[in-house]
């Protein structure tokens, strides 16, 4: 595939990445799949500046990111190391709360109304953000 040099239509460029901000809601797995079909991934927050950029665009709305602990430890969808990476949890979070009555705990992370993170039930239909790196090779065939 060819290397992407600019962002697709309706995506926003920031620091060599492209971002797409949904205006509807999906469960985390469906949001994850949506981004993958766009040759992207749910947003992975690696710095204070990226956090600020994303929260500016989403506003005070619960929004999925590419962080989950469905298989035990917290993991970023692109393989970025969680333990050594940027974190911005709300106080007392993540708490894997079981009291919601929906079965199980809370395995998926989202931005809250103040930008900080919370873990929640992955089935909740929140907005989401896709991210793709400009420097990575696109899966699309090159134009002839």
């Amino acid at each position: 595939g060819s290397e992407r040099t600019c962002c697709p239509v309706n995506w926003v460029e920031h620091e060599r990445s492209c971002y797409w901000f949904s205006r509807s809601g999906k469960a985390w797995a469906d949001a994850d799949n949506y981004c993958r079909l766009e040759d992207a991934h749910l947003v992975v927050v690696t710095s204070w500046e990226e956090q600020k950029f994303v929260q500016h665009h989403i506003g005070p709305v619960n929004t999925w990111m590419g962080l989950h602990d469905q298989n035990g430890p917290w993991k970023w969808v692109d393989g970025t190391d969680y333990e050594t990476g940027f974190k911005n949890w709300r106080p007392e979070q993540p708490d894997d709360w079981y009291g919601h009555g929906l079965g199980g705990g809370e395995d998926c992370a989202h931005f809250t109304d103040d930008g900080r993170w919370n873990d929640d039930v992955c089935q909740r239909p929140y907005r989401w953000v896709c991210e793709t790196e400009l420097d990575k090779a696109s899966q699309e065939p090159p134009l002839l």
Epitope: F53, H56, P60, G115
Partner: antibody, heavy 119, light 107 residues
Framework: QVQLVESGGGVVQPGRSLRLSCAAS????????MHWVRQAPGKGLEWVAV????????YSADSVKGRFTISRDNSKNTLYLQMNSLRAEDTAVYYC????????????WGQGTLVTVSS | DIQMTQSPSSLSAFVGDRVTITCRAS??????LNWYQQKPGKAPNLMIY???SLHSGVPSRFSGSGSGTDFSLTISSLQPEDFATYYC?????????FGPGTKVDIK
């Protein structure tokens, strides 16, 4: 009401150390990021450092990196600034301030404590 | 580091005047621009955060605008208690740098 009270300032010789404290009350200290900001006599404001609500992350200005350490004790509702290898240019009023989530602005400030570095 | 500049560095105005102070960042800070008021011998007070949101208790004669690198603080009708020094601060990227300040005094 929100109250922040700094202490620990004074006159100190260059190269020596000092620890500032900021006692917080009137809000749930353990849920707020906190800042130190300083102001040299007759000069403008200079941001010094920020620490996450749980102490898990911290950032500081290049001018103090490796010399100053921001820390906190949530059980005592107290923020600290450990200042080592002090220089004359560190002479300033030091303010602690509460962080406003989302904007990272400082929404409440203490009255400040004066640090004078002089031989 | 992001550098912040303010203009003018000082201004004299009458009570009732409309006053505008500008602040420029050396790179894009999106909307993460805050304004503080400081009176002599006192701690600063937050006036406006994220460009245009008024902090609680701040009179509505204060307003902020801008985006990217250029921002402004406007006082629609200057009151005696508004004579002070005003600082802008970016909170997009650490270190959270301040502008050099604008002193507003009575003409």
């Amino acid at each position: 009401q929100v109250q922040l009270v700094e202490s620990g300032g004074g006159v100190v010789q260059p190269g020596r150390s000092l620890r500032l404290s900021c006692a917080a009350s009137g809000f749930t200290f353990s849920t707020y990021n906190m800042h130190w900001v300083r102001q040299a006599p007759g000069k403008g404001l200079e941001w010094v450092a920020v620490i996450w609500y749980d102490g898990s992350d911290r950032y500081s200005a290049d001018s103090v990196k490796g010399r100053f350490t921001i820390s906190r004790d949530n059980s005592k509702n107290t923020l600290y600034l450990q200042m080592n290898s002090l220089r004359a240019e560190d002479t300033a009023v030091y303010y602690c301030a509460r962080d406003r989530a989302y904007s990272s602005s400082s929404d409440f400030w203490g009255q400040g404590t004066l640090v004078t570095v002089s031989s | 580091d992001i550098q912040m500049t303010q203009s003018p560095s000082s201004l004299s105005a009458f009570v009732g005047d409309r006053v505008t102070i500008t602040c420029r960042a050396s790179q894009n800070i999106i909307s993460y621009l805050n304004w503080y008021q400081q009176k002599p011998g006192k701690a600063p007070n937050l006036m406006i955060y994220v460009t245009s949101s008024l902090h609680s208790g701040v009179p509505s004669r204060f307003s902020g605008s801008g985006s990217g690198t250029d921002f402004s603080l406007t006082i629609s009708s200057l009151q005696p208690e508004d004579f002070a020094t005003y600082y802008c601060q970016q909170s997009y990227s650490t270190p959270f740098t301040f502008g050099p300040g604008t002193k507003v005094d009575i003409k």
